[in-house]
């Protein structure tokens, strides 16, 4: 969702629902900055390329981040 003039955050709503890492096309973690004072996690799903904003405070999402980083560390040499 687009940015307002003064604040350049993206997410209007956030989801607490668990996401299957296998169904993820991309996971963006955007740190807080001078443009947006909150961390934003944006998941792009393989199906239809649908995007979803995830709740950084949700236990399910924290578990997802752990699983994804674990998978990435496996892949790196």
């Amino acid at each position: 969702v687009p940015l307002s003039r003064t604040v350049r955050c993206t997410c209007i709503s956030i989801s607490n629902q668990p996401v299957n890492p296998r169904s993820l096309e991309k996971l963006e973690i955007i740190p807080a900055s001078q443009f947006c004072p909150r961390v934003e996690i944006i998941a792009t799903m393989k199906k239809k390329g649908e995007k979803r904003c995830l709740n950084p405070e949700s236990k399910a999402i924290k578990n997802l981040l752990k699983a994804v980083s674990k998978e990435m560390s496996k892949r790196s040499p």
Epitope: V1, S4, V7, C11, I12, S13, R38, K51, R52
Partner: antibody, heavy 120, light 108 residues
């Protein structure tokens, strides 16, 4: 179950102010964006304003920009619409609606509406 | 601003008949269209989102189709409670989020 209850409507003179409220229950309020949508008598639906789950993002329709302000209180599960410099064309039923929690905006639950009449 | 044009303005049908409502966007909105039903004195109710997905609790007789600029809401067999006004809405990624002017489905 999800419930949204709108209040604060009434008859007001042009140029005056009014504050609408929406009380939410039955869902995790602080993860959902909230909208106001209005409907003039016998007319269609017009989106008015949105506020993000944490109050950081706010957007307004051009027709109300600079006159209306949307706010929320996550500790009380409330959304408000402060309407200043009211005009006759603001006469409508105002509905509070929940954002779908999807990337693209739609309105999955609605309040019952509150009627605002601007008339001298 | 994306403009949505609904047709026809009024549809006069009998219970049991099939209703086909059209919504055309002034520019492509991919599949990001929702449909709402509104009965007199009531708030709108979400029926369909993303052009073809039924919202929770919506009967199977309601279906949606289309993409790009042309969308259709079909009610396969009208029930008495289906006589109402139907609005389409585009869910683009920037405000304002606009609605069509509505199609009234009335009893013939």
């Amino acid at each position: 179950q999800v419930q949204l209850v709108d209040s604060g409507g009434g008859v007001v003179q042009p140029g005056r102010s009014l504050r609408l409220s929406c009380a939410a229950s039955g869902f995790t309020f602080n993860t959902y964006g909230m909208h106001w949508v209005r409907q003039a008598p016998g007319k269609g639906l017009e989106w008015v304003a949105v506020i993000s789950y944490d109050g950081i993002i706010k957007h307004y329709a051009d027709s109300v920009k600079g006159r209306f302000t949307i706010t929320r209180d996550n500790s009380k599960n409330m959304v408000h619409l402060q309407m200043n410099s009211l005009r006759a064309e603001d006469t409508a039923v105002y509905y509070c609606a929940r954002d779908s929690s999807s990337w693209y905006v739609y309105f999955d639950y609605w309040g019952q509406g509150t009627l605002v009449t601007v008339s001298s | 601003e994306i403009v949505l044009t609904q047709s026809p303005a009024t549809l006069s049908l009998s219970p049991g008949e099939r209703a086909t409502l059209s919504c055309r966007a002034s520019q492509s909105v991919s599949s990001y269209v929702a449909w709402y039903q509104q009965k007199p004195g009531q708030a709108p109710r979400l029926l369909i989102y993303d052009a073809s997905n039924r919202a929770t609790g919506i009967p199977a007789r309601f279906s949606g189709s289309g993409s790009g600029t042309d969308f259709t809401l079909t009610i396969s067999s009208l029930e008495p409670e289906d006589f109402a006004i139907y609005y389409c809405q585009q869910r683009s990624n920037s405000p304002p989020w606009t609605f069509g002017q509505g199609t009234k489905v009335e009893i013939k």
